[in-house]
């Protein structure tokens, strides 16, 4: 059976604060727990939600959380349902409200010597206690001619006189907290001799050189005085007008008229009423000069047919606020329909191609009118003028693929090669009309090309296959100068490609035939054993039917490849002595020798006094220093061949001889002694 380990219990709660109704259940099977409020299931919200099997309140609400809560548990296996004891909240709260006139029924009926009752609309639970204030000063109960009824939250003034005038407010406090009136009541019981406002001047906005009128009236017994002042406190009368207000007239009823208003007349005007007694009443009104700024430019807009679009017209800054309307073809747009104006927006619903054109936003106020055009283009899906065609392009020449389309606005054309976007570079160029130019067609350009033409309304695409007509060419072109090693086997390759497989043959440049030890095997010239006579000029000829023939000239040199007669050896030298690194090479043509020391070529013309390279190739370094240590490379080269060999040079300090050592004792390591 279901057992409630913890049952929810009734409790005090504070409005807007946290609370928790606990419920813990034990049952044989899996249990569903849910909550009821006055018998109806409680739905989770961010404010009130199930927390495990308990019900959590993030902020108690006196209206939504009043009633009886019950925890319901249902054993999913046995089907049993059990309900907890009922629980409810005693919610403590206080809520601010205004001070209102209870008696008489309206402010107009308040007269000196009548009874006035004010009510404080602060409410709460438990019932709060109230305190009244006039102009911020507390009113104590039982003071002369006012009574406070805390039960009814009322303040009664009997009889009310001018001395009761002021701003009435109230505060209330309870166990929950305190609150003060959200809106206060100004009681004004006039002394007849005090000036009272009958008509207050209003701010006005006028266009330049127009007229402006301010009305102002006060009443009192005896009648009050009235005076107008401009910003700089200069009085305005019909007898003494300030220089910049020459066109001002004050009428008997207190109204002030300004004619032919100029910018210098703009500012604050004060109307001052003074009764026989009491303070002066100062009323202010501002004269603004109408103005309107220029409108920002519109960017041209491109829309697609069938869509709904809006163009917002930002009204220019202006005084008074400019009114805005849209026109098309000189006709003002309606406020409903398919193309209409909504607020400051131009709305085009279910756009048609015929909606394209110039729309004008107008703005106007007293200062004038401004307008700004927006050009609306209705995009169309591109259509074909000329699709790309399968093409045969010649290798090495420029090739063109057309993609000519038309649409509004002008379509954007992109090209793909093997599904990869072609970015313009030195080889590819896309013309304004969409045509693709391949600047110098290569064999591997033979593939699929696809062009896509797009506008905001949509896109079309087509593809074409390019076949490259290969030119007759050597692949690779033979080196024009080549060397063969004397008395050795040698081969000189020559291969070519073309639209048809070319025939390749070699001949001597003088037209003489090849000797019998030289064979031409499918383009490879083969020398079984190179002789001096094999040197000379040879021509490789590649030919096929459709493309004719091409020739490549090769000068063959017969050489004896370089060998070293003498190679430099690992050398150790005392500091200050002379080092000799020997190197001698032989070959035909006779090789030249260069030295490289410490990773840089030693230039014979810039060696300085300490170094010298002999005719036979040896390198001598006088007065060696530790920094001369390192690897030295002897490089032998001729027009056919290059070879190098290297050896290290070590520079060491000369040891100081010990007493016991005789003058003839040998050095500790193999040295060059000079």
């Amino acid at each position: 059976a279901i057992v409630f380990i913890k049952q929810p219990s009734s409790q005090d709660a504070l409005q807007g604060r946290r609370a928790l109704l606990r419920c813990e259940v034990e049952a044989p099977g899996p249990v569903h727990v849910y909550w009821l409020l006055d018998g109806a299931p409680v739905q989770d919200t961010e404010r009130r939600f199930a927390q495990g099997s308990s019900l959590s309140f993030a902020a108690v609400d006196r209206l939504q959380d009043s009633g009886t809560f019950q925890c319901v548990a249902r054993d999913d296996v046995t089907g049993e349902e059990a309900r907890s004891a009922n629980a409810s909240f005693n919610i403590k709260w206080i809520e601010a409200g205004p001070v209102v006139l209870k008696h008489p029924a309206s402010e107009a009926e308040i007269q000196p010597q009548t009874q006035v009752t004010l009510r404080c609309h602060i409410d709460g639970h438990p019932r709060p206690t109230y305190q009244w204030f006039r102009d911020g000063t507390p009113l104590s109960d039982g003071q002369s001619n006012h009574t406070v009824s805390s039960k009814e939250r009322n303040l009664t003034l009997r009889p009310a006189g001018p001395e009761h005038s002021g701003l009435y407010s109230c505060c209330a406090h309870s166990a929950f907290g305190q609150a003060c009136s959200s809106q206060n009541f100004t009681l004004s019981i006039a002394d007849e001799s005090f000036a009272r406002v009958v008509l207050a001047p209003q701010d006005v906005v006028v266009a330049r050189y127009e007229e402006a009128m301010f009305h102002c009236q006060f009443s009192a017994q005896p009648p009050p005085s009235l005076q107008w002042l401009f910003e700089d406190e200069t009085p305005i009368t019909n007898r003494s007008r300030p220089p910049h207000l020459r066109r001002a007239t004050v009428f008997a009823n207190g109204s002030l008229l300004l004619t032919q208003v100029r910018p210098r007349n703009a500012g604050i005007y004060r109307c001052i009423g003074q009764g026989q007694r009491g303070p002066p009443i100062i009323l202010e009104a501002t004269l603004h000069l109408a103005e309107i700024e220029d409108m920002p430019l519109f960017e041209p807009r491109v829309f697609t047919a069938g869509s709904e679009e809006r163009v917002t017209c930002l009204p220019p800054k202006g005084l008074p606020e400019p009114s805005v309307w849209w026109e098309h073809a000189g006709v003002r747009l309606p406020t409903h329909g398919r193309v209409y104006q909504k607020g400051h927006e131009l709305v085009l619903a279910n756009i048609a191609e015929s909606d394209a054109g110039v729309y004008t936003c107008h703005a106007a106020n007293l200062a004038g009118q401004r307008r700004q055009d927006v050009n609306i283009t209705v995009a169309t899906v591109p259509s074909w003028l000329k699709k790309p065609q399968d093409s045969q392009l010649e290798e090495g020449k420029p090739g063109y693929l057309d993609c000519l389309t038309q649409a509004t606005p002008k379509p954007t054309v992109v090209w793909y090669r093997n599904q990869m976007l072609i970015s313009e570079d030195s080889r590819f160029e896309v013309f304004k009309n969409g045509t693709l130019r391949i600047n110098s067609v290569e064999v591997y350009d033979g593939t699929w090309y696809r062009c896509m033409s797009s506008t905001p309304a949509g896109s079309i695409e087509a593809q074409a296959r390019v076949q490259v007509l290969e030119k007759l060419k050597f692949t690779p072109p033979p080196q024009p100068q080549q060397c063969m090693e004397f008395d050795k086997e040698a081969t000189v390759p020559c291969s070519a490609t073309g639209r048809e497989k070319p025939t390749i043959k070699w001949e001597r440049a003088d037209g003489s035939s090849l000797p019998e030890w030289v064979t031409d095997n499918a383009g490879t010239l083969h020398f079984a054993r190179v002789t001096r006579d094999d040197a000379g000029n040879y021509t490789c000829i590649a030919s096929n039917g459709p493309q004719g023939q091409i020739r490549a000239h090769v000068q063959l040199t017969v050489a004896v490849f370089i060998t070293f007669k003498v190679e430099p050896e690992r050398t150790t030298v005392y500091q200050g002595h002379t080092a000799l690194l020997q190197c001698e090479a032989q070959g035909d043509p006779k090789p030249l020798i260069q030295w490289k020391g410490k990773d840089r070529i030693l230039d014979p013309t810039k060696l300085g006094p300490r170094m010298h390279i002999f005719q036979n190739g040896s390198l001598v370094i006088h007065d060696v220093a530790p920094e001369d240590s390192g690897r030295y490379t002897c490089i032998a080269g001729n027009s056919c061949n290059i070879k190098h060999t290297e050896a290290p040079l070590y520079v060491v300090d000369k040891p100081v001889p010990e007493e016991s050592e005789g003058p003839g004792s040998p050095p500790p390591y193999k040295m060059i002694q000079t």
Partner: antibody, heavy 113, light 111 residues
Framework: QVQLQQSGAELMKPGASVKISCKAT????????IEWVKQRPGHGLEWIGE????????NYNEKFKGKATFTADTSSNTAYMQLSSLTSEDSAVYYC??????WGQGTTLTVSS | DIVLTQSPASLAVSLGQRATISCRAS??????????MHWFQQKPGQPPKLLIY???NLGSGVPARFSGSGSGTDFSLNIHPLEEADTAMYFC?????????FGGGTKLEIK
């Protein structure tokens, strides 16, 4: 021990209504939900809804609203399911169950003209 | 509604071997840390019998050869070692929310 005894097989004409009963013994009838399940050959099991007899609270599968109506008589410890506007689609075996644990033997309903 | 997909629709397993049936829910059937997923066995002409409740708890009088596992959306029923009497239809059911829904069923046969 807990037992649920269902009424016998029914043969009904299309358009008619039928009331199937499920008598419970061996426990406090009011405090336990009775669920109703439909089984058609090749259609598996379908949950129709449930009733808590003591309170008359019900939950229906939206699919069976207007088709099935649950009632319970606590004096006789019997739950009822009425099926209205019968069609051949209503031909099936109907089970009552207390929770997941205890099931009635099933009532076969055949709707045929 | 929560949809329960059972797999396989049918399977044949040798005596003494292990049979595994899966049930996948279209959304989680977990609440307050409990998985509201149950397994039933039904033999021809009989009402369904509760085997496993709350994903892994053995029903009353059900042999320990039956076990259940899983949480959230993926659940399985295991029978090991298989006996002749286990030939039946097996159904999964969720009771997290109304309407309670059943899986399409798995027919288990002994090879």
């Amino acid at each position: 021990q807990v037992q649920l005894q269902q009424s016998g097989a029914e043969l009904m004409k299309p358009g008619a209504s039928v009331k199937i009963s499920c008598k419970a013994t061996g426990y406090t009838f009011s405090n336990y939900w009775i669920e109703w399940v439909k089984q058609r050959p090749g259609h598996g099991l379908e949950w129709i809804g449930e009733i808590l007899p003591g309170r008359g609270s019900t939950n229906y599968n939206e699919k069976f609203k207007g088709k099935a109506t649950f009632t319970a008589d606590t004096s006789s410890n019997t739950a009822y399911m009425q099926l209205s506007s019968l069609t051949s689609e209503d031909s099936a075996v109907y089970y009552c169950a207390r929770g997941k644990q205890y099931w009635g033997q099933g009532t076969t309903l055949t709707v045929s003209s | 509604d929560i949809v329960l997909t059972q797999s396989p629709a049918s399977l044949a397993v040798s005596l003494g071997q292990r049979a595994t049936i899966s049930c996948r829910a279209s959304e989680s059937v977990d609440n307050y840390g409990i998985s509201f997923m149950h397994w039933f066995q039904q033999k021809p002409g009989q009402p369904p019998k509760l085997l496993i409740y709350a994903a892994s708890n053995l029903g009353s009088g059900v042999p320990a050869r039956f076990s259940g596992s899983g949480s959230g959306t993926d659940f399985s029923l295991n029978i090991h070692p298989l006996e002749e009497a286990d030939t039946a239809m097996y159904f999964c059911q969720q009771s997290k929310e109304v309407p309670r829904t059943f899986g399409g069923g798995t027919k288990l046969e002994i090879k």
